[in-house]
């Protein structure tokens, strides 16, 4: 196997490989860095396995895998010192690579000459007490979120950020306005910014008015 | 009104784990707040020692990281404090704070709003 | 880690006296993450301002920040006898959240 790499986006997080097995036969292992191998995807002809389930037990810890071949309708050693060969992934450390998701615009609501846009806070696949911690339960005040918005009469767009998953925001009576909002971990060095949410704009339905 | 309350051992010895514990009352340690703690030494500034949220999720003073650590008690509305392998240089007195929202300039912003009176740990044996 | 530099150490001021507190920060701060704290003897910090410039519920407007990026000011317009204390500016952007080493305001 070669090419291992890790696909992952708000902790759901799979390995993929090459190539596509022709008559052998995968099987998986991942460890962190102190910890003992553990095998997943046994004997698969897939070239992806997902590591889900793994990663979520601790998603500060940095994990390794590796993809062993075995010659179809062989599970013995291939190698030349009685062992499978076997390929390494990169290192893996979740919290600090994951992918942000898009995120998603939940509500907002104008009062005045204020607007109250809120942020839907996605559950991920972490757990804790038997409970699906949502992002801002596992990133805490790492992610902000940075919310674009401008008149939909115009393209001059303004920004605003948020250590929580709230705006409050000016804007001018009478105008309607379009956001979107980016989640962003500044203190990453890889994978800081997620894709911009879908656009959502004053008078649809997820938006209220008061006077 | 939300009060804070650190107790613990006022004296431990060297080598030993410094262990407080910071009791949370006229409000929820799950309302959206980041819980932290804060030591003082005699007659000097401030240090932030790291800080929690009621998830669990933390971030420690890198200075420190190796020997920290910050847990929550959601069914007691307390947070802790251990500090292991003290020396004398971990004598002070130590504070836990509230650390809530504040709006500012379009988003919000969180600050430590609320302290408690603080504790006075020495090292000594 | 952002090192925050507190001037002046010590303010020996009278009553009614304005005082103008100095925090400079190693590298550049986003003021929404930037707070004063007063201190007196024996008690615990209280925040006075946060977001550079608005003060907390409370706090008397003879109190005003301003600043951004690496300069910050706190001004105490009037003193008054309670506002004899230690002063410390605060960074919450960057991990070490990190204090200023403190300015003393002192009666004169």
């Known amino acids: 196997a070669f090419n291992l790499t890790w696909i992952s986006t708000d902790f759901k997080t799979i390995l993929e490989w090459q190539p596509k097995p022709t008559n052998y036969t995968y099987t998986v292992q991942i460890s962190t860095k102190s910890g003992d191998w553990k095998s997943k995807c046994f004997y698969t002809t897939d070239t992806e396995c997902d590591l889900t389930d793994e990663i979520v037990k601790d998603v500060k810890q940095t994990y390794l895998a590796r993809v062993f071949s075995y010659p179809a309708g062989n599970v013995e050693s291939t190698g030349s010192a009685g062992e499978p060969l076997y390929e390494n992934s990169p290192e893996f450390t979740p919290y600090l690579e994951t992918n942000l998701g898009q995120p998603t615009i939940q509500s907002f609501e104008q009062v005045g000459t204020k607007v109250n846009v809120t942020v839907e806070d996605e559950r991920t696949l972490v757990r804790r007490n038997n409970t699906f911690l949502s992002l801002r339960d596992v990133f805490g005040k790492d992610l902000i979120y940075t919310l674009y918005y401008w008149k939909s009469s115009s393209s001059g767009k303004k920004t605003a950020k948020t250590n929580t998953n709230e705006f409050l925001i000016d804007v001018d009576k009478g105008e309607n306005y379009c956001f979107s909002v980016q989640a962003v971990i500044p203190s990453r060095t890889v994978n800081r910014k997620s894709t911009d949410s879908p656009v959502e704009c004053m008078g649809q339905e997820k938006g209220e008015f008061r006077e | 009104q939300v009060q804070l309350q650190e107790s613990g051992p006022g004296l431990v010895k060297p080598s030993q784990t410094l262990s407080l514990t910071c009791t949370v009352s006229g409000g929820s340690i799950s309302s959206g707040q980041y819980w932290s703690w804060i030591r003082q030494h005699p007659g000097k500034g401030l240090e932030w020692i790291g800080e929690?949220?009621?998830?669990?999720?933390?971030r420690y003073n890198p200075s420190l990281k190796s020997r920290v650590t910050i847990s929550v008690d959601t069914s007691k509305n307390q947070f802790s404090l251990k500090l292991s392998s003290v020396t004398a240089a971990d004598t002070a007195v130590y504070y836990c704070?509230?650390?809530?929202?504040?709006?500012?300039?379009?988003?919000?912003?969180?600050?430590?709003?609320?302290w408690g009176k603080g504790t006075t740990v020495t090292v000594s044996s | 880690e952002i090192v925050l530099t507190q001037s002046p150490g010590t303010l020996s001021l009278s009553p009614g006296e304005r005082a103008t507190l100095s925090c400079r920060a190693s590298e550049s701060v986003d003021s929404s993450y930037l707070a004063w704290y007063q201190q007196k003897p024996g008690q615990a910090p209280r925040l006075l301002i946060y977001?550079?410039?608005t003060r907390q519920t409370g706090i008397p407007d003879r109190f005003s920040g301003s600043g951004s990026g690496t300069d910050f000011t706190l001004t105490i317009s009037r003193l008054e006898p309670e506002d004899f204390a230690v002063y410390y500016c605060?960074?919450?952007?960057?991990?070490?959240?990190?204090f200023g080493g403190g300015t003393k305001v002192e009666i004169k």
């Open positions: 605060q960074q919450a952007g960057v991990v070490p959240y990190t």
């Open positions: 977001g550079a410039s």
């Open positions: 704070a509230r650390d809530a929202p504040y709006y500012y300039g379009g988003g919000y912003y969180y600050y430590m709003d609320v």
């Open positions: 929690i949220y009621y998830s669990g999720s933390t």
